[in-house]
């Protein structure tokens, strides 16, 4: 799976969309999870309604919401009041039994609020040394991760 980058501004809401084949994943609940380390597990953040027929109902876990358009085949995740610590690698998943198929890998980047004059030095931009000039941007907030880019900060 390629990784798609979604950029949001600190303090604002970020909407992440994950398209999928609605027939292939018919009847399956969906989930949003956060990747813990490059090869670590993906920790569930929020999942759609326990009843698949009610997947269109928005479910919240803290500041993260999920809703599924099962006919159109689009899973939407909203990260409200985006914070620097929200930056990182996530996955949209399709659940069947105890298994999860990856629908999309997502890298969330948090940009400093231009109106916020506090020190932005603690904001982390994964792969910030890379040039993104030629990167593809979807809806002005997302792009595909360039080959060779590292989705996690280097560990000491």
């Amino acid at each position: 799976h390629n990784t798609t980058v979604f950029q949001g501004v600190a303090g604002q809401s970020l909407q992440v969309s994950c398209p999928y084949d609605s027939m292939k994943h018919w009847g399956r609940r969906k989930a949003w999870c956060r990747q813990l380390g490059e090869k670590g597990p993906c920790q569930r953040v929020v999942s759609t309604h326990n009843l698949w027929l009610l997947s269109f109902l928005r479910r919240w876990n803290g500041s993260t919401a999920i809703t599924d358009d099962t006919l159109g085949g689009t899973l939407t995740i909203t990260l409200r009041n985006l914070q620097p610590h929200d930056a990182g690698l996530y996955q949209c998943q399709s659940l069947h039994g105890s298994e999860a198929d990856t629908l999309r890998k997502v890298l969330v980047e948090v940009l400093a609020d231009p109106l916020d004059h506090r020190d932005a030095g603690d904001l982390w931009f994964p792969g910030e040394s890379e040039s993104f000039e030629d990167a593809h941007v979807e809806h002005s907030i997302s792009r595909s991760l360039l080959e060779g880019e590292i989705p996690f900060p280097p560990t000491s």
């Epitope: 084949d21 027939m23 292939k24 018919w26 009847g27 399956r28 609940r29 009843l51 698949w52 027929l53 659940l95 069947h96 039994g97 105890s98 298994e99």
Partner: antibody, heavy 123, light 107 residues
Framework: EVQLVQSGAEVKKPGESLKISCKGS????????LAWVRQMPGKGLEWMGI????????RYSPSFQGQVTISADKSISTAYLQWSSLKASDTAMYFC????????????????WGQGTLVTVSS | DIQMTQSPSSVSASVGDRVTITCRAS??????LAWYQQKPGKAPKLLIY???SRQNGVPSRFSGSGSGTDFTLTISSLQPEDFATYFC?????????FGQGTKLEIK
Amino acid sequence: EVQLVQSGAEVKKPGESLKISCKGSGYSFTSYWLAWVRQMPGKGLEWMGIIYPGDSDTRYSPSFQGQVTISADKSISTAYLQWSSLKASDTAMYFCARSRTFYYDSSDYFDYWGQGTLVTVSS
Amino acid sequence: DIQMTQSPSSVSASVGDRVTITCRASQGISSWLAWYQQKPGKAPKLLIYAASSRQNGVPSRFSGSGSGTDFTLTISSLQPEDFATYFCQQADSYPRTFGQGTKLEIK
């Protein structure tokens, strides 16, 4: 009416190749996963693998990975199971089965089965 | 892989009897379990899915129960056409695995 019609019985020699088929009708073939299940003589059922004909996404049981190839041709609503080099131990009845996801619990079960293809491998 | 163990491996019963077949999973599988009936020379037929939901057209004398690791299939009043082999199957994870089967014979 949903139907899965499998190709006829085969008698082969060890080392030969073989491709058996399963043709789906009465439903949208590209919209359901389709599995292959082995039943050796007098024995139980073994799940070999599964394919989504819409995009040919395939999963194999570790026991069968590298031993068989599962494929599909959506233009003729047909799935295939093939061997490049048969062994006597491949002698069995092979079933294809449609996998249907039930939204009650978001998992899938085999609701329609083909009649089976008997493969005999003997020198 | 998840191992599925059925008991008994065979059972003799008479028409009208109540029969219970059990299936145990080597690890918890929630309610992701199916029961199939197979007659000699025929393909299996789905009876029960999601541990307790009856497939369309399956007589009400067939019922399933259980969750986690222990499951049962009950036939409340055996009919002549019920003599067959029954398999459980977990739908929790890949690879899907079946029990070894329970042969239901006429006493």
